[in-house]
């Protein structure tokens, strides 16, 4: 009796179970009573990443330098090419089809995580005791100057955008 369902990595055709093609290969012809499924490898610029009965391999992604992209990992017959962005840029989306410049953290904010080719700069507000007076994609919030260690006193309080201003201690005469 012909099968109605097939095992894993098989498919049903002409009332018989044929093997799927392994990753990196495409289907050329179904199995017959005489021969196994006919599969052929994907050509150099193509891939298939699953057990399949695809008749065409997928083209490797092109990392377009005009969009700020470069190859992070070259594709194989079983994997797609992975693109990333040139320095100073990051991917606009998870699929990384184009790049945008890293954002800078404004004064009052510091860099929590420096941007990579695939993620943007993460900024955080400078907490009390820290400040940032520049717009930067690299600089963290810096601590206020400790006037005491310089044997000075705070003459002007710091903010999240400015450092404290230290000055000499007032010497009271006896």
């Amino acid at each position: 009796e012909p099968p109605t369902a097939c095992r894993e990595k098989q498919y049903l055709i002409n009332s018989q179970c044929c093997s799927l093609c392994q990753p990196g290969q495409k289907l050329v012809s179904d199995c017959t009573e005489f021969t196994e499924t006919e599969c052929l490898p994907c050509s150099e610029s193509e891939f298939l990443d699953t057990w399949n009965r695809e008749t065409r391999c997928h083209q490797h992604k092109y990392c377009d330098p005009n969009l700020g992209l470069r190859v992070q990992q070259k594709g194989t017959s079983e994997t797609d090419t992975i693109c990333t962005c040139e320095e100073g840029l990051h991917c606009m989306s998870e699929s990384c089809e184009s790049c945008v410049p890293h954002r800078s953290c404004l004064p009052g904010f510091g860099v929590k995580q420096i941007a990579t080719g695939v993620s943007d700069t993460i900024c955080e507000p400078c907490p009390v005791g820290f400040f940032s007076n520049v717009s930067s994609a690299f600089e963290k919030c810096r601590p206020w100057t400790s006037c005491e260690t310089k044997d000075l006193v705070v003459q002007q309080a710091g903010t999240n955008k400015t450092d404290v201003v230290c000055g000499p201690q007032d010497r009271q005469r006896a």
């Epitope: 055709i13 002409n14 289907l27 050329v28 012809s29 179904d30 017959t32 005489f34 021969t35 196994e36 006919e38 052929l40 490898p41 050509s43 150099e44 610029s45 193509e46 009965r53 008749t55 065409r56």
Partner: antibody, heavy 117, light 111 residues
Framework: EVQLEESGGGLVQPGGSLRLSCAAS????????MCWVRQAPGKGLEWVAC?????????YYASWAKGRFTISKDISKTTLYLQMNSLRAEDTATYFC?????????WGQGTLVTVSS | DIVMTQSPSSLSASVGDRVTITCQAS??????LAWYQQKPGQAPKLLIY???KLASGVPSRFSGSGSGTDFTLTISSLQPEDFATYYC?????????????FGGGTKVVIK
């Protein structure tokens, strides 16, 4: 019964055209690669062209066949075709249709094409 | 394009003999090689595919071996019905297209 049956061969003058057909039956035509192979009288086998019979329709040609010969298929009729133009005496051969690409697991009996004036 | 060189072009042998036919590809074709048997007035019949896999229904006296560029068809003990012409067939990608080629054939005749 699983079979391939060629037709359309015959006598044609040099420079003429001919269209060969291959009717497939007994298997799922649309999920197979189908090819034409020819054999000149008393000579060896020579690959002509192949096509994936499904929707993708990927085609493959021998370098000498490009331009003069065109392979095509009709899924609804489960039929493979070979359009041959500008025929020459050296195209005289038995033309076989076959299933497969890296191996030919099923063959028709062939149709004879004679190019002569 | 790929070229398949088959040798010998003919050989004479007796029933019971061990027969070996070789096929060389002009470039590596991995294991994508098939062997066929053809008798006069008939279509070729697939014997071996993927270099060493026996097509169903083919007697076990036929075997294939090899990979890359060098391949062999062996008939361990020649039978009367084995007198025929044998062809190898290889294929490989040429750019993004696939190209098929046959060897010139080996005619096995009775000694």
């Amino acid at each position: 019964e699983v079979q391939l049956e060629e037709s359309g061969g015959g006598l044609v003058q040099p420079g003429g055209s001919l269209r060969l057909s291959c009717a497939a039956s007994g298997f799922d035509f649309s999920s197979n690669t189908m090819c034409w192979v020819r054999q000149a009288p008393g000579k060896g086998l020579e690959w002509v062209a192949c096509i994936y019979a499904g929707s993708s329709g990927s085609t493959y040609y021998a370098s000498w066949a490009k331009g003069r010969f065109t392979i095509s298929k009709d899924i609804s009729k489960t039929t493979l075709y070979l359009q041959m133009n500008s025929l020459r005496a050296e195209d005289t051969a038995t033309y076989f249709c076959a299933r497969g690409l890296s191996r030919f697991s099923l063959w028709g009996q062939g149709t004879l094409v004679t190019v002569s004036s | 394009d790929i070229v398949m060189t088959q040798s010998p072009s003919s050989l004479s042998a007796s029933v019971g003999d061990r027969v070996t036919i070789t096929c060389q590809a002009s470039q590596s074709i991995s294991n994508y090689l098939a062997w066929y048997q053809q008798k006069p007035g008939q279509a070729p019949k697939l014997l071996i595919y993927d270099a060493s896999k026996l097509a169903s229904g083919v007697p076990s006296r036929f075997s294939g071996s090899g990979s890359g560029t060098d391949f062999t068809l062996t008939i361990s003990s020649l039978q009367p019905e084995d007198f025929a012409t044998y062809y190898c067939q290889g294929g490989d990608y040429y750019g993004s297209s696939y190209v098929v080629a046959f060897g010139g054939g080996t005619k096995v005749v009775i000694k």
